[in-house]
Interface confidence: medium
């Protein structure tokens, strides 16, 4: 299974390279929600490109909320450290790409994508609705994009 | 007839461990998602934990991760849960119900009760 | 603090209409999940009353309906009986980051 290797400038004190999100949601805004409650959370801040601490409320706010630092860096950084010290970065698919295709257990059908690592392909399947897995995505492009070669 | 039978429940104390199990008879056990949903004494229903039909993919709600875990063996017709590090909160009666049309639990059992205390 | 919020409790006359409201917010019912809802008569499980926001499993009296709007969902009873005395939840999804199965709090009817 091997990977092409992705070009990256060299990165220097002053320059960041564009910021490549592995999922749109790790762009939003930390959101403690309308609540009340006091709770520590992490939220991946695109600006100094890190997770970092805020307290949620406890209901509503948007999917840029974690349990955990290591959940939230899993979820939205890729290995910067590593694109300081290479020029090239041999890029490597999140973990969730090679979960199986899990439609959930509800009963809503709808149209999703995921990545399959037998074919090595993103292909269609049908979502229930509710729960199932990360290796779920609207659309194609947003599959290919994040976990085929 | 659909019927849902746990049982298993008990007296444990803090940090301890109970495993419960939910017989299933008059449908296609295989064929349907499996719940477990809690209800502590006086106190409204929660979802602890759900299993696909083949046992493949498993779920869990926030209160229980790390320390449940459902399984389950169709060819008895037999949903568990296991519950390590039992917490006074986890006091309740613990229901096994299978998911049907929608998202919703179509049968449940009569429940078995978790009395965690020391 | 339960994620769907229920009146706690409410009452009616034998005979008349009673309306349960269940009000989520745009993670859940707001994001087109359908809402359940269950009968606890006292002392038993849960029974399903209403799946996929408006029907009914057999057996369930066409008394009981249901309905969803944006963030907010109800159960309606009408020709209230003595025997509707019980409690009722309203059920979701949540696509919060850790979702999950949500309820209501629950609402506790009383038939006067």
């Known amino acids: 299974d091997s990977e092409e290797d992705e070009e990256h400038t060299i990165i220097t004190d002053t320059e960041l390279p564009p910021l490549k999100l592995m999922h749109s949601f790790c762009a939003f805004k930390a959101d403690d929600g309308p609540c009340k409650a006091i709770m520590k959370r992490f939220f991946f801040n695109i600006f100094t490109r890190q997770c970092e601490e805020f307290i949620y409320g406890g209901c509503e706010g948007n999917q840029n909320r974690f349990e955990s630092l290591e959940e939230c860096k899993k979820m939205c950084t890729r290995d910067n450290a590593n694109r300081i010290i290479k020029t090239t970065l041999q890029q490597e698919k999140p973990d969730f790409c090679f979960l199986e295709e899990d439609p959930g257990i509800c009963r809503g059908y709808i149209t999703r994508y995921f990545y399959n690592n037998q074919t090595k392909q993103c292909e269609r399947f049908k979502y229930g609705g509710c729960l199932g897995n990360m290796n779920n995505f609207e659309t194609l492009e947003e599959c290919k994009n994040i976990c085929e070669d | 007839e659909v019927q849902l039978v746990e049982s298993g429940g008990g007296l444990v104390q803090p940090g301890g461990s109970l495993r419960l199990s939910c017989a299933a008879s008059?449908?296609?056990?295989?064929?349907?998602?499996m719940s477990w949903v809690r209800q502590a004494p006086g106190k409204g229903l929660e979802w602890v934990s759900a299993i696909s039909g083949s046992g493949g993919s498993t779920y869990y709600a926030d209160s229980v991760k790390g320390r449940f875990t459902i399984s389950r063996d169709n060819s008895k017709n037999t949903l568990y849960l296991q519950m390590n590090s039992l917490r006074a909160e986890d006091t309740a009666v613990y229901y096994c119900a299978n998911n049907g049309a929608a998202a919703a639990w179509d049968y449940w059992g009569q429940g078995t009760l978790v009395t965690v205390s020391s | 603090q339960s994620v769907l919020t229920q009146p706690p409790s409410l009452s009616g006359a034998p005979g008349q209409r009673v309306t349960i409201s269940c009000t989520g917010s745009?993670?859940?019912?707001?994001?087109?999940?359908?809402v359940q809802w269950y009968q606890q008569l006292p002392g038993t499980a849960p029974k399903l009353l209403i799946f996929?926001?408006?029907n009914r499993p057999s057996g369930v009296p066409d008394r009981f309906s249901g309905s969803r709007s944006g963030t907010s969902a109800s159960l309606a009873i009408t020709g209230l009986q003595a025997e509707d005395e019980a409690n009722y939840y309203c059920?979701?999804?949540?696509?919060?980051?850790?979702?999950?199965?949500?309820f209501g709090g629950g609402t506790k009817l009383t038939v006067l």
């Open positions: 059920q979701s999804y949540d696509r919060s980051l850790s979702g999950s199965m949500v």
């Open positions: 008059g449908f296609t056990f295989s064929s349907y998602a």
């Open positions: 745009s993670s859940n019912l707001g994001a087109d999940y359908d």
């Open positions: 996929g926001n408006n």
